[in-house]
């Protein structure tokens, strides 16, 4: 074993913005301090096999597997991955150690597996085994689809950079409004990436994988539709592609469409037009405005004009980071037991949010509906009149938002009692929070009208169970009341409830409900 070289195996993890990675596989730039992979000789293996510790890599991360060989003379090497030979270029560092590197750029499922490195030195041959796995399936991604124009064709390509690779489908609808709901018969789905038929009323592209489904609507201005009362607004992040479609129908072909940004015509190469005749021989024209990667100066009013229709505009706002705008102050509601009521949150967000409603550690699905003014709304009605704390949580790639609601159900108190050798306690969850009275039942007061005021300790809202306040009252036992029946009563504006307790020696206490 003394002839064996001293070898060191390391993992170098590169930060995602490391532009130097991969420029030269021989000299990758180090982004983080290397992590030792503790190459150890594999016992009971034919030949000399070193095994590095298994490596787990985030999806889309870039890494370098590196071997440092302290052996005299030259070395030659070969990488083998999934039965394919990969080029290997050793070099020498300042300590004259042989350095062999394997750069894995933007780690994907297909790059996971066993990497074998065969090294031949003047003294001996040996193999080094690396095992690379995806770090966690929780790190799968599902990204919102975006559009690109197909090269040399009037067609759109839908792209979603997701892991695992998603199924992409176009969702088309030629009706207006509500009839374009997902499961409507007016909706047509096409499971393909390229779409040539771009004249439909409503065009969306959806991508789905193990994580779910994300959709992007093709933003459209229809010059034949009455404009919205508020100007339509489109948000985009810096670097994202901009696509706006302007659509117009006219009795003949004698009309044209143009796009302007802040009263200046769009540059050539930032728009393209298509036209077709519809079944009733009217002419449909569409004019796309597009920017492959938006910058801050692409913000502004985009106006589509026609020689035969009133022009319409949309406000495009380019932001550095996504956002969720809504008021996060907590809200308290007080309702009757059978009153219909829904919580609601109105918000403006980009990109679209994922959200949940939570009550009592249980999560409920969250639906969002777009309003005409650019805001969205999420409502929750499934509270089943259970009092407590309800939480709305929303997040997108860049922002998080949480809003708390408290629901109080107006109802008459209900009393529960318990007793020990030294005290008796009563609890109630009625709302509004009840007040308490204690009464002693005796020969002098068979109707239990003799009020007890000494030794009473009231605790309003002593225990918060998922936001539901519980009020309690405790009576410390004195010789004067030992052996007597006592009655605790809780009352609020909706009524009174009492519980009778026998204060005798320690042991189980009979309770006589008295409502």
């Amino acid at each position: 074993n003394q002839d064996l070289p001293v070898i060191k195996c390391v993992l170098i993890n590169h930060k995602n913005n490391d532009s130097s990675v991969g420029k030269s596989s021989s000299y990758p730039m180090v982004s983080e301090s290397p992590e030792d992979l503790g190459c150890a000789l594999r016992p009971q293996s034919s030949g000399t096999v070193y095994e590095a510790a298994a490596v787990e890599v985030d999806v889309s991360a870039s890494i370098t597997l590196q071997v440092l060989v302290d052996a005299p003379g030259n070395i030659s090497c070969l990488w083998v991955f999934k039965h394919s030979s990969l080029n290997c270029q050793p070099h020498f560092d300042l300590q004259n150690r042989g350095v062999v590197s394997m750069v894995i750029l933007k780690m994907t499922e297909t790059q996971a597996g066993e990497y074998l490195l065969f090294i031949q030195s003047e003294a001996t041959n040996y193999t080094i085994l690396f095992t690379v796995s995806i770090r966690n399936t929780l790190l799968y991604t599902l990204r919102r689809p975006y559009f690109r124009k197909m090269e040399n064709q009037d067609a759109l390509v839908c792209i979603s950079e997701s892991v695992p690779e998603p199924i992409v489908e176009w969702v088309l609808c030629d009706s207006q409004g509500e009839s374009c709901k997902e499961e409507s018969p007016a909706v047509v789905k096409k499971e393909e990436k390229v779409l040539h038929e771009l004249f439909g009323t409503d065009i969306r592209c959806c991508a789905r994988n193990e994580l779910g489904r994300e959709c992007t609507r093709l933003f459209t201005i229809d010059l034949n539709q009455t404009p919205q009362t508020t100007l339509p607004q489109l948000f985009l992040k810096v670097g994202e592609p901009l696509w706006i479609r302007c659509k117009a129908v006219h009795v003949n072909h004698g009309f044209g469409l143009t796009w302007e940004l802040e009263n200046k015509a769009l540059e050539e190469g930032n728009y393209f037009e298509m036209s077709t005749y519809s079944t009733n021989r009217t002419m449909i024209r569409i004019l796309f405005a597009f920017v492959s990667s938006v910058a801050r100066n692409d913000t502004g009013y985009y106006t589509c004009s026609s020689s035969k229709h009133p022009s319409q505009s949309a406000l495009v706002t380019i932001v550095e980071k996504g956002f969720i705008n809504a008021t996060n102050s907590s809200e308290d509601y007080e309702i009757d037991q059978y009153e219909e009521f829904c919580f609601s949150v109105r918000f403006k967000a980009y990109p679209q949010i994922r959200c949940t409603w939570t009550f009592s550690r249980k999560s409920f699905p969250c639906e969002q509906k777009g309003l005409d003014n650019g805001y969205s709304i999420s409502k929750f009605c499934n509270h089943k009149h259970q009092p407590g704390e309800y939480i709305f949580h929303a997040e997108n790639d860049d922002a998080q938002f949480t809003k708390m609601f408290t629901l109080n159900i107006r109802r008459k108190p209900q009393v529960l009692a318990e007793a020990s050798a030294s005290q008796a306690s009563c609890f109630s969850d009625g709302y509004p929070l009840p007040s308490w009275t204690w009464k002693k039942c005796s020969d002098k007061s068979p109707n239990c009208t003799e009020e007890i005021t000494e030794g009473v300790w009231n605790r309003k809202a002593n225990r918060k169970v998922f936001g539901q306040w519980v009020s309690s009252s405790t009576l410390n036992m004195s010789e004067a009341i030992k052996g007597f029946l006592v009655k605790c009563c809780a009352y609020n504006s909706l009524g009174t409830s009492c519980e009778t307790i026998l204060l005798n020696s320690p042991g189980p206490f009979p309770f006589i409900q008295d409502n």
Epitope: N13, D36, L37, C39, A40, E51, A54, E56, S133
Partner: nanobody
């Protein structure tokens, strides 16, 4: 500093089953990869099984594949090794091991940062 305490070892007949547990205390258990190693009398310590920080990936030595199952419960700070179809050659002191990184899995002894005291498993009729 992490403390690891194994339990569950003992005498078992060939073909029998045993479950080893390793309770961890110290820094957040879920923030590092864990593994099991064993050392038979007169032999070097060898890798048995390892599991990633999240539990999503598992790794086994060829000699135990299909018979042993490694798992972890991050909420209980505990690592497990379920051993079935035990053989005489499985007799050894079993050590629980923790790495110092979420990226490097403890499949070789040099990357182990923390060791347990060990628990003896004897497979004999």
């Amino acid at each position: 500093e992490v403390q690891l305490l194994e339990s569950g070892g003992g005498l078992v007949q060939p073909g029998g089953s045993l479950t080893l547990s390793c309770a961890a205390s110290g820094r957040t258990f879920s923030s590092y990869a864990m593994g099991w190693f064993r050392q038979a009398p007169g032999k070097e310590r060898e890798f048995v099984a390892a599991i990633s920080w999240s539990g999503s990936n598992t790794y086994y030595a060829d000699s135990v594949k299909g018979r042993f199952t490694i798992s972890r419960d991050n909420s209980k700070n505990t690592l497990y090794l379920q051993m079935n179809s035990l053989r005489a050659e499985d007799t050894a002191v079993y050590y629980c091991a923790a790495g110092g990184s979420t990226r490097v899995v403890v499949t070789t002894t040099p990357v182990v940062k923390y060791w347990g005291q060990g628990t003896l498993v004897t497979v004999s009729s």
